[in-house]
């Protein structure tokens, strides 16, 4: 058993039929020593008497706010979550695995430049009763500052009859530098509690890995005289860290038709300019890259031909 | 990435080329390591990360763009004293482009050089033959010394007299390239920020 | 500490009609409250929750058939536009102040919806 | 999300013993009730929490199960126990929210 913050413990579990589980002593919060009854949750059954409660947990029924009691006045609580471990795995409930960019994926993260500053977010199909908190930190046995906020409701998706929920947060790391080379990674831990199930989940990376530009900007075609070609020109996206010179970006360029299965023609190039051969009813997209570092690329920005 | 290249103008900053050659060449050396050691710790979440030029050169600080001086996160060993040599620095006379910064880049590849030429010799001796290194990373490296032009002494390489364990030869492989490769990322934003100065 | 549901009559198909539920013993804001039908003969099917802070959550079947919400002593249930299949007895029910999806251990008598052309 | 009773209806004997089984659709841990619901009348809270009774029930009704399998046990049968006996989940009530279809019971 241990502490997850002040008057809420969490008991792990082995989690298999018939498990013995583990015998809990509980101790009031107070200098009284006698007249005290304990009882759990909203019920009125007096569990015991005494200063402390000894008690076995083994499922969630035994789980749950157990209150000290004296004469009709409440002395303390003990909040008691439940962490389960089933064939030696911690539980995995509460988030969905999002099996990108592997199978036990539950935590993703991307930033859009080399500040320090990222998101991360997870999913799961439970709504209600549900709190989530995170940590972050560079490295993990000499561990370096990383801030974060609290964790939001981002989006709300509907999958044929259930809905699916994202929740997402924002980090900082606290003395970043944009040039450094990392050699510790980041450390994300989410604690998630749903009713009285303790479950957490990590993600490590480095910020370079998870690196994916916004967008590039101001996305424009010129025509070029007596030609079917136009010259598209763009700009580093405002949120790309700067000196643009140094975190430099490569572009592709793409010439889609209105078709999916038309053939797609596509130019790479460092500029932030090209020139392509605009078709009727097509569109011309741009995405970047870090040039030097091939993380992910930024999703299109798009303007049609005509 | 397999993109179409475009080759620099002669008139461009000398080392530009060579530095592209470089991250082409070790990027390519560490996906062929990764695959053809795949039952091998290779990859960024299984290996460790050491740098083997911690505390002999400082690179990124003496290579830091003129606009990150501002940040403190950035200066934490910062070397402010510089040597005037290399011909890289061409004529140009930006305070950025500190022949201290060149001078670190050249110490990087001279060490990396000696512990890649070492690594090679134990791999030459494997029974199994599994993996070597690709010469051409090896002349690429020797290109941008060459470019780089800084008169340094020569270090010995290192002879092991015991019998070399090809297991950890090929997880130090692992360790050496993933840090070549990100010194080579670092290199690459410096050529093409002093290019563009 | 009990609920009382109002407002069940005769309507004729697509009339809109408002179901109230009034609680006493108790505050809404330390609750969540449940809406849950019955056709005759037939077993309970929940409609919608509203909990303590207000939020409403809905069965997937409702699809903005029916709209939960409440004041400081009552709680509706506004049915939009009523079919046959909507004859039913409505029971308002109480949470037991745990958690926002409960169970349930105050009800209601019921009030009964008959809809007819 | 499926609450599945079985059986849907069960006959027994004053004092005999029924069991009535509920399963549901995926795991719920133990956040199961079960009600009871006679003609007229509204549902009334057995247990709770899978196996907790409810204030003022008598203890010959007595839950069990956890996770897809749960199980209502009454005793000692008694006349005024006929009844419907509804099981409900309230894990969550996207993820796994509704009530069973019910076990009538007619005690002979």
């Known amino acids: 058993i241990w502490e997850l913050k002040k008057d809420v413990y969490v008991v792990e579990l082995d989690w298999y039929p018939d498990a013995p589980g583990e015998m809990v002593v509980l101790t009031c919060d107070t200098p009284e020593e006698d007249g005290i009854t304990w009882t759990l949750d909203q019920s009125s059954e007096v569990l015991g008497s005494g200063k402390t409660l000894t008690i076995q947990v083994k499922e969630f029924g035994d789980a749950g706010q157990y209150t000290c009691h004296k004469g009709g006045e409440v002395l303390s609580h003990s909040l008691l979550l439940l962490h389960k471990k089933e064939d030696g795995i911690w539980s995995t409930d509460i988030l969905k695995d999002q099996k990108e960019p592997k199978n036990k994926t539950f935590l993703r993260c991307e930033a859009k430049n080399y500040s320090g500053r990222f998101t991360c977010w997870w999913l799961t199909t439970i709504s209600t009763d549900l709190t989530f908190s995170v940590k972050s930190s560079r490295g993990s046995s000499d561990p370096q500052g990383v801030t974060c906020g609290a964790a939001t409701l981002s989006a709300e998706r509907v999958r044929g009859d259930n809905k699916e929920y994202e929740y997402s947060v924002e980090c900082q790391e606290d003395s970043a530098c944009p040039a450094a080379e990392e050699s510790l990674p980041i450390e994300v831990m989410v604690d998630a509690v749903h009713k009285l199930k303790y479950e957490n989940y990590t993600s490590s990376f480095f910020i370079r890995d998870i690196i994916k530009p916004d967008p590039p900007k101001n996305l424009q075609l010129k025509p070029l005289k007596n030609s079917r070609q136009v010259e598209v020109s763009w700009e580093y996206p405002d949120t790309w860290s700067t000196p643009h010179s140094y975190f430099s970006l490569t572009f592709c360029v793409q010439v889609q038709g209105k078709s999916k299965r038309e053939k797609k023609d596509r130019v790479f190039t460092d500029k932030t300019s090209a020139t392509v051969i605009c078709r009727k009813n097509a569109s011309i997209s741009v995405r970047a890259q870090d040039r030097y570092y091939s993380s992910s690329w930024s999703e299109w920005a798009s303007v049609p031909c005509s | 990435r397999n993109l179409p290249v475009a080759t620099p103008d002669p008139g461009m900053f000398p080392c530009l080329h060579h530095s592209q050659n470089l991250l082409r060449a070790v990027s390519n050396m560490l996906q062929k390591a990764r695959q053809t050691l795949e039952f091998y710790p290779c990859t960024s979440e299984e290996i460790d990360h050491e740098d083997i030029t911690k505390d002999k050169t400082s690179t990124v600080e003496a290579c830091l763009p003129l606009e990150l001086t501002k940040n403190e996160s950035c200066l934490n060993s910062r070397e402010t004293s510089f040597i005037t040599n290399g011909s890289c620095l061409a004529s140009r006379k930006t305070s950025f482009m500190m022949a201290l910064c060149l001078s670190s880049i050249y110490e990087d590849l001279k060490m990396y050089q000696v512990e890649f030429k070492t690594m090679n010799a134990k791999l030459l001796m494997d029974p199994k033959r599994q993996i070597f290194l690709d010469q051409n990373m090896l002349a690429v490296i020797d290109e941008l010394m060459q470019a780089l032009n800084f008169n340094s002494e020569t270090v010995p390489q290192k002879s092991s007299l015991e019998e070399p364990d090809f297991y950890k030869t090929k997880i130090k492989l692992c360790i050496l390239l993933h840090a070549f490769r990100i010194r080579a990322v670092t290199i690459d934003r410096v050529m093409s920020y002093l290019n563009a100065s | 500490q009990s609920v009382e549901e109002s407002g069940g009559r005769l309507v004729t198909p697509g009339t809109p009609l408002t179901l109230t539920c009034a609680v006493s013993?108790?505050?809404?804001?330390?609750?969540?409250m449940i809406w849950v039908r019955q056709a005759p003969g037939e077993g309970l099917e929940w409609i919608g929750i509203?909990?303590?802070?207000?939020n409403t959550y809905y069965a997937s079947w409702v699809k903005g058939r029916f709209t939960i919400s409440k004041t400081s002593t009552t709680v509706d249930l506004k049915m939009i536009s009523p079919t046959t299949e909507d004859t039913a007895t409505y029971f308002c029910?109480?949470?037991?102040?745990?958690?926002?999806?409960?169970?349930?251990?105050?009800w209601g008598p019921g009030t009964l919806v008959t809809v007819s052309s | 999300f499926e609450l599945t009773q079985t059986p849907s209806s069960v006959e027994a004997a004053v004092e005999g013993t029924v069991t009535i089984k509920c399963q549901a659709s995926?795991?719920?841990?133990?956040?199961l009730s079960w009600y009871q619901q006679k003609p007229g009348q509204p549902p009334k809270l057995l247990i709770y929490?899978?196996?907790k009774l409810a204030p003022g029930v008598p203890s010959r009704f007595s839950g069990s199960g956890s996770g897809t399998q749960f199980t209502l046990t009454i005793g000692d049968l008694e006349c005024a126990d006929a009844a419907t006996y509804y099981c409900?989940?309230?894990?969550?009530?996207?993820?796994?929210?509704?009530f069973g279809g019910g076990t009538e019971v007619v005690v002979v």
């Open positions: 029910a109480r949470g037991s102040g745990a958690y926002i999806s409960d169970y349930f251990n105050v």
């Open positions: 013993g108790f505050s809404l804001s330390g609750y969540t």
């Open positions: 509203i909990s303590s802070s207000g």
């Open positions: 995926q795991s719920i841990d133990s956040w």
């Open positions: 929490s899978a196996s």
């Open positions: 409900q989940s309230y894990y969550d009530v996207n993820a796994g929210y509704g």
